[in-house]
């Protein structure tokens, strides 16, 4: 019997210092570029080698960025989100949602990490 895939969602505040080449990551998403169905949120699509984000080590590809320096990223056009990061200053605070895939046991069995029950 196949196991069920669940997701463990956690949030984290990540403080980055802009490096010589910037923050060092790429994003997808926005109201005009939905990366995830029915979700116009902003997601990390690439971490640049040796960039500020890579050297910090906490930001991961696939993370959803909820806010930048306290400013919500909901309902933004893609380019507006890009510009927000570019104009965020030297010290940048990111509120991030990590989504960790958890493989549970067979259906009908409450596997480890199953929040139900």
């Amino acid at each position: 019997m196949n196991g069920r895939v669940d997701y463990l969602v956690t949030e984290e505040e990540i403080n980055l210092t802009r490096g010589p080449s910037g923050l060092g990551f790429n994003i997808v998403g926005g109201t005009d570029q939905q990366y995830v169905s029915n979700d116009s949120g902003i997601y990390v699509s690439r971490i640049k080698e040796n960039g500020a984000a890579a050297l910090d080590g906490r930001l991961q590809e696939g993370d959803k960025i909820l806010s930048v320096n306290g400013q919500d990223l909901k309902n933004l056009l893609h380019q507006d989100a890009v510009d927000l990061f570019r104009n965020a200053g030297y010290a940048v605070s990111l509120r991030v949602q990590h989504r960790l895939q958890v493989q549970n046991g067979p259906i009908g069995h409450r596997g480890e990490g199953d929040p139900s029950g």
């Epitope: 997808v28 005009d32 960039g51 990061f85």
Partner: nanobody, 127 residues
Framework: EVQLVESGGGLVQAGGSLRLSCAAS????????MAWFRQAPGKEREFVAA????????YYADSVKGRFTISRDNAKNTVYLQMNSPKPEDTAVYVC?????????????????????WGQGTQVTVS
């Protein structure tokens, strides 16, 4: 994994025209930033043109500005390079490059390090 396949190369006369295509795999093609580079024998890889995810912004090397046009069709997962009035010095292998998403830093379209995925290339010879 993104795969890029170029086509449309061949022999063209100087002053003629040629259209190169680059077909990309992946359901999120509309988030890719795309570019064309070229490499002539014994020379460094050279930036030709780039286009953003929506097609609203394009960038060109000075050597091709006004002659070449980059465009994309997100419904077909394809980016194009229209080569008008090619010159013998445009002879090279033309390679397509892609990256998923937009950099939050200063965009340097001519920098190969901006891109993660590369095609095998298509030969263009201008006689």
């Amino acid at each position: 994994e993104v795969q890029l396949v170029e086509s449309g190369g061949g022999l063209v006369q100087a002053g003629g025209s040629l259209r190169l295509s680059c077909a990309a795999s992946g359901r999120t093609f509309s988030t890719y930033e795309m570019a064309w580079f070229r490499q002539a024998p014994g020379k460094e890889r050279e930036f030709v043109a780039a286009i953003n995810w929506s097609g609203s912004s394009t960038y060109y090397a000075d050597s091709v500005k006004g002659r070449f046009t980059i465009s994309r069709d997100n419904a077909k997962n394809t980016v194009y390079l229209q080569m008008n009035s090619p010159k013998p010095e445009d002879t090279a292998v033309y390679v397509c490059a892609a990256v998923i998403g937009s950099t939050v830093d200063e965009y340097r379209p001519s920098d190969p390090l901006e891109y993660d995925y590369w095609g095998q290339g298509t030969q263009v010879t201008v006689s």
